[in-house]
């Protein structure tokens, strides 16, 4: 029987900069029941606070609701693991909510085959940013990535769309049914999950791009 091993806070995420959650990995338990507590203070403060919510984020997590979340202050946090034989602490972790945003997937994905008379046909893809993300403030730059593949293919074809919310694709296999998805990330955050797939049938007379 031993004191617990050193825990590690390995992940913090915010869906929209208004709330956030951090998760830790326990160290070895030393063969005894172990209690974990997360304490934190914010830059410029000396007063330590305990995690306000150990439930919402699931096991080994701390959730900071709206009233506990500030974009203006860096959070300094650590996890304490305690059993009957002693305690151990994680390294201190510094968190700036701006840099942990993982948005929801983009919305309203629409896909259409366009066949202009005077130009090559193309696949036109359009979407909207996730609702929770406020792009008007200016500091939030969302980047988008599209993936598509014929229904029975194993490999996805990936296109980086930058900041635009629409995209054209010229090279497609005629007569095939394609799956299309889109995801987004803030410039210094994390990729969202892929949006639900949208299906599109490519007409047999669709001319491949040279």
């Amino acid at each position: 029987q031993l004191p617990p091993g050193k825990p590690e806070i390995f992940k913090c995420r915010s869906p929209n900069k208004e709330t956030f959650t951090c998760w830790w990995r326990p160290g070895t338990d030393g063969g005894l029941p172990t209690n974990y507590s997360l304490t934190y203070h914010r830059e410029g403060e000396t007063l330590m606070h305990e995690c306000p919510d150990y439930i919402t984020g699931g096991p080994n997590s701390c959730h900071f609701g709206k009233q506990y979340t500030s974009m203006w202050r860096t959070y300094i946090m650590m996890v304490n693991a305690t059993n009957q034989m002693g305690s151990s602490f994680s390294d201190e972790l510094y968190v700036d909510v701006t840099y942990i945003v993982q948005p929801d997937p983009p919305l309203e994905l629409a896909v259409e085959v366009k066949q202009p008379e005077d130009r090559k046909p193309y696949l036109w893809i359009k979407w909207s940013p996730p609702t929770l993300i406020d792009l008007k403030t200016g500091w939030f730059t969302l980047l988008y990535e599209i993936r598509l593949k014929p229904e029975k293919a194993a490999e996805w074809e990936i296109h980086f769309a930058g900041q635009q919310t629409e995209f054209k694709i010229l090279s497609l296999h005629p007569g095939q049914k394609y799956l299309v998805q889109v995801r987004c990330k803030p410039d210094h955050g994390y990729w969202s999950a892929w949006s639900p797939a949208t299906f599109i049938q490519i007409p047999s007379d669709f001319t491949m791009n040279d």
Epitope: G44, L93, W139
Partner: antibody
């Protein structure tokens, strides 16, 4: 404890390439961005770029686009920077650094001295 | 790119004195999220830089309270009260508000 291990020195020929390594230990490698910084002898520091090891997403200083390529090997918790078409201007100490969930970095490797010489 | 101008380039001090280093940026370092990402590093001879102060005035873990940072917008100052021998080296200011991140040219703190 957090460590970023870099080789001490590399001697390379002009016109060739060199791939510098930065082996991370003491933390979950995919959690934090890795930055690269150049320091010429007796001079200041220049930020080259950064990479997110979780998905290999990169941001570069325009000045180093085409000169530096940042990659990671998640299986060995190692970040790499390849420098191409080397000239005497590339002779410098190159540091890797690690951020927290922030845009500034507190942990630095010991640096690799690259000497470009025939 | 944001140019960071440090003064003085060299600062001779006596042990126990107060030292003050100035850093001026060519544009405001207030991020659109309201934070100011101005930091100070110390590089001792033959070593990699070490973080002292982050976001203008916050001491990093383990940094003695004789180090303090202040300023706003484009003008920033690092003060060292009662300089000790272990404080000697080159001090760099750095900004991470704008990409590319940039550094000052350094101020060498040396014994008078």
């Amino acid at each position: 404890q957090v460590q970023l291990q870099q080789p001490g020195a590399e001697l390379v020929m002009p016109g060739t390439s060199v791939k510098l390594s930065c082996k991370a230990s003491g933390y979950t490698f995919t959690s934090y961005w890795i930055h690269w910084v150049k320091q010429r002898p007796g001079q200041g520091l220049e930020w080259i770029g950064e990479i997110d090891p979780s998905d290999s997403y990169t941001n570069y200083n325009q000045k180093f686009k085409g000169k530096a390529t940042l990659t990671v090997d998640r299986s060995s918790s190692t970040a790499y920077m390849q420098l191409s078409s080397l000239t005497s201007e590339d002779s410098a100490v190159y540091y890797c650094g690690r951020s927290f969930f922030t845009n500034w970095f507190a942990y630095w490797g010991q640096g690799t001295l690259v000497t470009v010489s025939a | 790119d944001v140019v960071m101008t440090q003064t003085p380039l060299s600062l001779p001090v006596s042990l126990g004195d107060q030292a003050s280093i100035s850093c001026r940026s060519s544009q405001s370092l207030v991020h659109s999220n309201g934070n100011t990402y101005l930091h100070w590093y110390l590089q001792k001879p033959g070593q990699s830089p070490k973080l002292l102060i982050y976001k203008v005035s916050n001491r990093f873990s383990g940094v003695p309270d004789r180090f303090s940072g202040s300023g706003s917008g484009t003008d920033f100052t690092l003060k060292i009260n009662r300089v000790e021998a272990e404080d000697l080296g080159v001090y760099f200011c750095s900004q991470s508000t704008h990409v590319p991140f940039t550094f000052g040219s350094g101020t060498k703190l040396e014994i008078k």
